[in-house]
């Protein structure tokens, strides 16, 4: 058997001595007949240890026993052990008794074999077994006096090699994790949740984290369980970012050619039908009317221009009716309405003019009179020594209903180069400079523009009693919407409940998956802020997209181009959205085009304005933005201006 | 461009006649009245009248009823102002403008001084 | 006849001040007043128009307000050149008639 290093020398060095072992024997025999029988010498001392070492220790040693005990001669019992045990310098024993194994006698002098574990001279020292390889243990070295052992760390446990430790499987334990997902790890485990979730130790349940908390969102945050939305505000022009926390404005992807002349008038400007330009004539000299302009539209009504004094007097309205000119006139009270020539709402200059003659009044399309009535007066009228006229563009001066045949009074169009009286007109041409929202697009095509600014709104039923029904009322929203759009995010159609502030529903084009949290280009129908339906759209090709959403009673679909959309609810949830609609529904709702009033964020999927070309069909009828209830007054109701040619 | 140009200054004695022009061009002569305007020296304005340049017909204020003839020559887009008989409170500058109900366009005014 | 009480005839003024003239009318006229500047040896130049609308090509200083029988020309922060005389006229009846000016002096 082989011992460690340090217990074979504590072995060796004694063993050196043994040799000796009868020498010993015989040297105690000799002490006893010189020094024990008879009073001895350091000479004779000398001669019986044959050494000095063991002299020097012994005779002063032997004077204290001669002193203690009187000489040998005294024959005291206590002399001869006193003295017998001078030289065993085991006795009494020096060495630990704890630790020592044997005590060994030298030549004046002592060696104590140390039991395993204890070390030092006297052996009353512990030896770290743990300080060397860590005693051998795998994990933990626990030393102790005289000894050591192994232990592992939590979540293992020591072989029965007393050395090596074993991970404990906690997962065994079906309690471990409660509801949660357990994973064991090497000496643990762990209590796993879906991602937005934390695992609650004392509940030992996983527990929905409140991200919005943590303050992630940059505007407006939505805890949901396991996940949360942040929302930005889209009626203030911004979107979410890429990194679906942060806002960022939302950038027209399309360049559309806004450019305006500045030498033209805008007549669609005021939503409230009033004039854009209100002229006042007045005159000493009897003069007649004279008007002439260059005139472009594509919107087949509304009033180009009324001369004349107030509403009970004497005037003439020049208007579009079904795209062709008509000309409403009163004379000292008599109304009289006279409609002739082409259609001219094709969105092309032509010049139109107004003269009064002697007794008629003759109105010129490019030169060639449509239009020549016989009148008996004058539409200059003599007030205090002055004649006077009043002149507005784009509207007249009193109410539609006053006309003699009421007319939607607001009209999408275009003038330049006009002429009143013949006179050079130097106020309109200054202010109109220096106010783009008085002028017109350079280049116009059909349909409607939303510049992204604001919406406008009607109020439409959308219950319908069918007459083989009797009293049950049926419901359906369809919409077709063509769109060229210039922006990534927006509302195209919306109805909004005034009463309960909410968003019943919403067709929008939005530039990520709000559950996915991914950036994509997409449709969403809404029902309040779930979305039903997703389809997918290549929003900035500068192309015209046909969005078709058709929502009855049990369905709800969406179409982008033909192609249907992806549903996002189960047939459950389906018709539980529907069910919410249809409450709407029955309440008052306003319809919305291009946006959403000034709701919370969270109401729908978007709130943004929506920014391009659209022209609306609500259940098989064109929405015309001049008859809304209200439009903003830079969406321009029939016209829209070309996506800008790409640079060569 | 609309402009009315006036003839040049005139000394006159008391009791002599003085006929003042005013060429109007940029415009159809016929289609505004021709307003006559006086302003004493250190004095403010004063509206004297106007000429209707369709019929020639003339209307004068009553301060100016007698002595003072407003008439035209439309062959030459031209409205004329005489003063008959002078004085020396006719001693003023006169100005020619074209009738908007108001007055946008002036001649650079004549003065005529009557002095003995 | 429509008579015109133009106040005051004259007043000082440093370039900066805020001047205002007023004129006062014998009856109610709308809002038919117009106003002229005129410096020495010029013919007047038209300010406002009716319906106190400010006229092309004169700086936004100068501003009409009133109706009725009270009106006032305001300039705002006045300039060198503004020093001149002014005038008021009304355009309401036959015969039109002018007030009696007021000189705006250097102070």
């Known amino acids: 058997a082989l011992l460690p290093a340090r217990e074979a020398t504590q072995f060796l060095r004694p063993r050196q001595r043994r040799a000796f072992q009868v020498f010993e024997e015989a040297k105690q025999g000799h002490l006893e007949r010189e020094c024990v029988e008879e009073l001895c010498s350091r000479e004779e001392a000398r001669e019986v240890f044959e050494n000095d070492p063991e002299t020097d220790y012994f005779y002063p040693r032997y004077l204290d026993c001669i002193n203690k005990y009187g000489s040998p001669y005294t024959k005291n019992s206590g002399f001869a052990t006193c003295v017998q045990n001078l030289p065993d310098q085991c006795t009494p024993n020096p060495c630990d008794r704890k630790g020592t194994q044997a005590c060994q006698d030298l030549m004046g002098n002592f060696f104590c074999l140390c039991k395993a574990g204890w070390g030092g001279r006297l052996c009353d020292k512990d030896v770290n077994e743990c300080s060397q390889e860590n005693g051998g243990c795998l994990q933990i070295c626990h030393n102790k006096p005289g000894s050591f052992h192994c232990s592992c760390h939590s979540g293992f446990e020591l072989s029965s090699d007393g050395r090596t430790c074993q991970d404990i499987d906690e997962c065994a334990d079906s309690e471990a994790c409660g509801e949660a997902r357990c994973k064991n790890l090497p000496g643990s485990y762990s209590c796993l949740c879906d991602e937005g979730f934390a695992y609650s130790s004392q509940e030992k349940a996983c527990r929905d984290v409140d991200e919005c908390l943590q303050g992630r969102c940059e505007q407006v945050c939505v805890n949901s369980p396991g996940s949360y939305t942040c929302h930005c505000d889209g009626r203030g022009g911004l979107k979410l970012s890429q990194d679906m926390d942060t806002c960022e404005d939302i950038l027209p992807c399309v360049p559309f050619s806004v450019a305006k002349s500045v030498k033209s008038l805008y007549l669609g400007r005021m939503f409230s039908g009033t004039p854009v330009i209100r002229l006042r004539f007045k005159r000493l000299q009897p003069t007649r009317l004279v008007a002439e302009f260059d005139f472009r539209t594509f919107d087949p009504e509304g009033i180009l221009l009324f001369a004349g004094g107030h509403q009970d007097s004497t005037w003439i309205v020049l208007a579009l009716r079904a795209g062709r000119l008509e000309l409403q006139l009163r004379y000292n009270g008599v109304g009289r309405v006279t409609s002739s020539g082409p259609v001219i709402n094709h969105g092309m200059w032509q010049t139109i003019s107004v003269e009064e003659l002697a007794r008629n009044l003759v109105i010129k399309v490019n030169r060639d009179a449509v239009m020549k009535i016989a009148v008996a007066g004058d539409l200059f009228q003599p007030e205090r020594g002055l004649y006077h006229l009043n002149l507005t563009v784009g509207g007249i001066p009193f109410h539609e209903k006053d006309l003699v045949q009421p007319i939607n009074p607001r009209l999408d169009g275009c003038m330049r180069s006009w002429n009143w009286l013949n006179g050079e007109d130097t106020t309109i041409q200054e202010t109109v400079k220096v106010n783009t929202r008085m002028q017109c697009f350079s280049v116009t095509e059909r349909g409607s523009f939303y510049p992204g600014s604001g919406f406008a709104f009607y109020s439409l039923d959308y219950m319908r009693t069918p007459l083989d029904v009797g009293t049950e009322s049926t419901w359906e929203v369809e919409v077709v919407a063509h769109i060229r759009p210039a922006a990534d995010t927006g509302v195209l159609f919306a109805l909004w409940a005034p009463d309960l502030r909410a968003v019943p529903l919403s067709v929008a084009l939005v530039d990520y998956h709000s559950t996915k949290k991914l950036k994509k280009q997409l449709v969403v129908l809404a029902v309040e802020h779930t979305a039903l339906a997703l389809m997918e759209i290549k929003v900035c090709d500068g192309q015209e997209h046909v969005v078709t959403v058709s929502l009855r009673d049990g369905e709800a679909t969406l179409e982008v181009d033909g192609t249907r959309g992806q549903s996002e609810v189960s047939a459950a949830q389906l018709q539980e959205r529907l069910a919410v609609l249809e409450r709407h529904l029955r309440s008052p709702v306003l319809t919305f085009a291009g946006g959403l009033p000034d709701v919370p964020v969270t109401s729908a999927p978007v709130t943004a304005f929506y920014r391009g070309c659209m022209t609306l069909e609500v259940n098989r009828r064109l929405l015309d933005l001049d008859e809304a209830a209200y439009k903003h007054s830079d969406i321009t109701a029939h016209s829209c201006p070309p996506v800008e040619p790409a640079a060569a | 461009q609309v402009h009315l140009v006036q003839s040049g200054s005139e000394l006159k004695k008391p009791g002599a006649s003085v006929k003042i022009s005013c060429k109007a061009s940029?415009?159809?002569?016929?289609?505004?009245?021709m307003n006559w305007v006086r302003q004493a020296p250190g004095q403010g304005l004063e509206w004297m009248g106007w000429?209707?340049?369709?019929?020639?017909?003339?209307t004068y204020t009553e301060e100016f009823k007698g002595r003072f003839v407003f008439s035209l020559d439309t062959s030459v887009t031209t409205s004329y102002l005489q003063i008959s008989t002078l004085k020396a409170e006719d001693t003023a500058v006169y100005f020619c403008?074209?009738?908007?109900?108001?007055?946008?366009?002036w001649g650079q005014g004549t003065l005529v001084t009557v002095s003995s | 006849e429509t008579t015109l009480t133009q106040s005051p005839s004259s007043l000082s003024a440093s370039t900066g001040d805020r001047v205002t003239i007023t004129c006062i009318t014998s009856?109610?006229?709308?809002?038919?007043m117009n106003w002229y500047q005129q410096k020495p040896g010029k013919a007047p130049k038209l300010l406002i128009s009716?319906?106190?609308t400010l006229r092309p090509g004169v700086p936004s200083r100068f501003s009409g307000s009133g109706s009725g029988t009270d009106f006032t020309l305001t300039i705002s922060s006045t300039q060198p050149e503004d020093f001149a005389d002014y005038y008021c006229?009304?355009?309401?009846?036959?015969?039109?008639?002018f007030g009696q000016g007021t000189k705006v002096e250097i102070k």
């Open positions: 403008a074209r009738d908007e109900g108001w007055f946008v366009y």
């Open positions: 940029g415009y159809t002569f016929t289609n505004y009245g």
């Open positions: 009856t109610d006229i709308d809002d038919d």
């Open positions: 000429i209707n340049t369709n019929t020639g017909e003339p």
């Open positions: 009716e319906g106190n």
């Open positions: 006229l009304q355009t309401d009846s036959v015969p039109l008639t």
